[in-house]
Interface confidence: low
């Protein structure tokens, strides 16, 4: 039986050109995490494998940094980065847990609600 739950940063917003941290945490289960996939809609951004470490998709290598933890840092944000992001936890023996984060990238400095920051 799958007893775990995923906590995420939820719906967040950031400014174009800025950076943001996407984070998830799997709790309430003793299952072993074997791999975490980060996906944007249907695109694979990155994989963190328990044995093999991090792999960043080549098309995102310049703008995606691994961490903190099993999270992901997105840099040089564009309006096209707006959308759903998923952290997919592959665990044994439970199976797969999925967390959802919605990111809105705004043109102006009117990002009103969300966990955002800008790194100069």
């Amino acid at each position: 039986m799958m007893t775990g739950t995923i906590e995420t940063t939820g719906n967040i917003s950031a400014e174009k050109g800025g950076s943001i941290i996407l984070q998830c945490h799997l709790s309430s289960t003793t299952a072993q995490v074997t791999q975490v996939n980060w996906e944007q809609q249907d695109q694979l951004l990155a994989i963190c494998n328990a044995d093999l470490g991090w792999h960043i998709s080549p098309s995102f290598k310049d703008r995606v940094a691994p961490g903190p933890g099993l999270g992901l840092t997105l840099q040089s944000l564009t309006v096209n980065d707006t959308g759903e992001y998923f952290c997919i936890y592959h665990t044994y023996p439970d199976g797969t847990y999925t967390g959802r984060i919605f990111l809105e990238v705004l043109e102006s400095s009117v990002a009103e609600h969300g966990a955002r920051f800008q790194i100069p």
Epitope: G10, S109, H113, A115
Partner: nanobody, 113 residues
Framework: EVQLVESGGGLVQPGGSLRLSCAAS????????MGWFRQAPGKEREWVAS???????WYADSVKGRFTISADNSKNTAYLQMNSLKPEDTAVYYC???????WGQGTLVTVSS
């Protein structure tokens, strides 16, 4: 608009402790993310630690086991407890939160004998 005020910095000897606070006013951080960053002289700003609303925490390797991040949503305040401080921890420390717009002024931590 959110305003963030960091405090608690100062001069401390190596091995000493400090507790930083970050008070948020305006649009409060009712959930989501709280983070601390720091910027040492002549270096880029770097992430130090962050916490989710459920209390789950992450730390940079350089501070793991020495620093503790926490957030009190009822007081709209985040904290960074810094123990076993080293000279290389010297920096201006900044916090970020939901609805965060500009960086705050930060608070200077100097670790020196």
């Amino acid at each position: 608009e959110v305003q963030l005020v960091e405090s608690g910095g100062g001069l401390v000897q190596p091995g000493g402790s400090l507790r930083l606070s970050c008070a948020a006013s305006g649009n409060t951080f009712s959930g989501g993310f709280m983070g601390w960053f720091r910027q040492a002289p002549g270096k880029e700003r770097e992430w130090v630690a962050s916490v989710l609303r459920g209390g789950y925490t992450w730390y940079a390797d350089s501070v793991k086991g020495r620093f503790t991040i926490s957030a009190d949503n009822s007081k709209n305040t985040a904290y960074l407890q810094m123990n076993s401080l080293k000279p290389e921890d010297t920096a201006v420390y900044y916090c970020t939160t939901e609805g965060f717009d500009p960086w705050g002024q930060g608070t200077l931590v100097t670790v020196s004998s």
